[in-house]
Interface confidence: low
């Protein structure tokens, strides 16, 4: 019968005849009156035999990657008779990994998008590489994910790709982060291979700032002449956060006199100071009235940075006008 | 913004040595690899070496081996490069450039470049 | 010689594209980041392309970088007087254990 044990040829051989083993026959005595054929796809280009010995040689470099087995068929013939010393069989050679394929990330680019002030914990988004190599041979395209670029605001699992957030961020001091991760295959052993991709992880706002007035004192003037409603002019407060986080309500904290109002222009986010009653220079020529300026949307989790609204302190002056 | 300032230059007879510092400024200097690099007359750009100013780890190029040594003083935030046996090939302009985190991460800093001449 | 090899020279007219290559091999372009600097005459070179295709801060985007294998490329579009410099592209070599760089590029703006 046949004797013979399984052919492996590792991939990407540089030598350029590589033994992978014997094929014989029992029936050999080894005084070379048999001749050893291979035949199939491969046989005489790829793999070649010792005619006299059955010794079978690669003289290709082969990629795993490209075809993992090739299927042969061996003949013994006796020289002396031409006949087939054993049945026509069948073998399998099959081509063993090595580590040559790079982690790739293949859904590049990665883009996040995280509120900022997240807690600790919180996960942005996960990335994935995959690695040509076989996952059944040894290490070769088992995957360990690290940050090169990113701390001490992200990390990632190493395992699994999942960025999470470590440090919480404020988008008023910097609104977006490269971080670069790095995908190592032969979980970080000697020999390992590796692939990086970016993550551009974009801060969303919070409510986070509250409005605060540019001045601690305005000083506005109206015309005792003004009937009630007239804009005697506009205060303005200044808002960190963005779009309807920046979106604010002006009132009046203080007046006595009960003379004025204050209504907010929510294109300009500006406070206008309208005139309520109107007003008589000789009986008062000036007020002294106290605004406040809150955000419009507070949630709940976010009062603790709103606690003490803004105020400034508006001087009105009364211009006098000639009466009849 | 970053600042990396080189010592002045240098004229220098073959076979003595040099030293030029490189002093660092306006980030956490022990958490960046420093790198030298020169620049003949006329010429590309040649990496020397790598230190890691933290540990005094150093990775010279093999060309160099043997004659450049790479130091770095965390308390003044300054690296250093000390060549020796100077021959006339050896003058260029020479700089320091900050690297990442890790030894293969891009120079994103240079400094202005310190001219050292060679010439008896 | 240098381990990344690129043309010496490459010339193109006020608003064309020009493209400036830069050849390596595994240990290098194949397996890590591809840097490109400039270097304006008489300055120190300074980051252009970091990570195969990143801009800092302050670049304009008409200067572009990829990687394909062992070879990278730069590309600056919408050419500029400005633009007249010596490029390099620069990679971690994992065999050598250190950093190369390219030759030089230079641009000439005609």
């Known amino acids: 019968g046949w004797v013979w044990n399984q052919f492996f040829v590792p991939e990407e051989m540089n030598t350029t005849s590589h033994h992978i083993g014997q094929l014989r026959s029992d029936l050999d005595n080894g005084n070379n009156s048999f001749q050893y054929k291979l035949l199939g796809a491969g046989a005489g280009s790829t793999f070649i035999i010792d005619e006299r010995t059955g010794d079978i040689y690669a003289i290709q470099k082969l990629d795993r990657e490209e075809r993992s087995l090739y299927i042969l068929r061996a003949q013994v013939i006796d020289i002396a008779t031409g006949r087939a010393v054993e049945p026509e069989s069948e073998f399998v050679i099959k081509v063993s990994d090595i580590n040559d394929n790079e982690p790739k990330f293949l859904d590049e680019p990665y883009e996040a998008i995280v509120p900022e002030m997240s807690p600790e914990g919180t996960l942005v988004i996960q990335v994935t590489a995959s690695d040509a190599d076989d996952p059944s041979s040894g290490n070769n395209a088992r995957l360990l994910y690290s940050l090169l670029q990113g701390q001490p605001y992200f990390s990632v699992e190493p395992t699994t790709g999942v960025i999470r957030i470590s440090s919480k961020m404020d988008r008023e001091l910097q609104d977006e982060y490269w971080v670069i991760i790095q995908a190592k295959d032969m979980i970080g052993q000697p020999g390992a291979l590796s692939g990086t991709t970016s993550v551009l992880i974009k801060l969303s706002d919070v409510n986070d700032n509250k409005p605060i007035f540019k001045e601690s004192l305005y000083r506005l003037t109206v015309s005792e002449s003004a009937p009630t409603g007239t804009s005697i002019g506009t205060i303005m407060a200044y808002d960190n956060d963005i779009g309807e986080n920046a979106e604010m309500d002006y009132s009046i904290e203080e007046d006595d006199s009960q003379t004025f109002d204050i209504i907010t222009n929510h294109e300009t986010q500006e406070g206008i100071v309208i005139l309520k009653k109107k007003v008589d220079f000789e009986h008062q020529n000036h007020y002294g009235i106290r605004a406040k300026v809150k955000n419009h949307h507070v949630p709940e989790q976010l009062m603790k940075y709103h606690t003490e609204a803004s105020t400034t302190f508006i001087k009105i002056q009364v211009e006098d006008v000639d009466e009849p | 913004q970053v600042q990396l300032v080189q010592s002045g230059a240098e004229v220098k007879k073959p076979g003595a040595s040099v030293k030029v510092s490189c002093k660092a400024s306006r980030y956490t200097f022990t958490s960046y690899y420093m790198s030298w690099v020169r620049q003949a007359p006329g010429q590309g750009l040649e990496w020397m070496g790598i230190i890691h100013p933290s540990g005094g780890d150093t990775t010279y190029a093999q060309k160099f081996q043997g004659r450049v040594t790479m130091t770095g003083d965390t308390s003044t935030s300054t690296v250093y490069m000390e060549l020796s046996s100077l021959r006339s090939e050896d003058t260029a302009v020479y700089y320091c450039?900050?690297?990442?985190?890790?030894?293969?991460?891009?120079?994103?800093?240079w400094g202005q470049g310190t001219l050292v001449t060679v010439s008896s | 010689h240098s381990v990344l090899t690129q043309s010496p020279s490459a010339s193109g007219t006020p608003g064309q594209r020009v493209t400036i290559s830069c050849s390596g091999s595994?240990?290098?372009?194949?397996?890590?980041?591809v840097n490109w600097y400039q270097q304006l005459p008489g300055t120190a070179p300074k980051l252009l392309i970091y990570?195969?295709?990143q801009r800092p801060s302050g670049v304009p985007d008409r200067f572009s970088g990829s990687k394909s294998g062992t070879s990278a490329s730069l590309a600056i579009s919408g050419l500029q007087s400005e633009d007249e410099a010596d490029y390099y592209c620069?990679?971690?070599?994992?065999?050598?254990?250190?950093?190369?760089f390219g030759g030089g590029t230079k641009l000439t703006v005609l």
């Open positions: 450039a900050r690297g990442g985190i890790k030894l293969w991460l891009h120079f994103d800093y």
């Open positions: 620069a990679v971690w070599d994992d065999s050598l254990n250190g950093w190369v």
């Open positions: 595994r240990s290098n372009i194949g397996s890590n980041f």
């Open positions: 990570t195969n295709n």
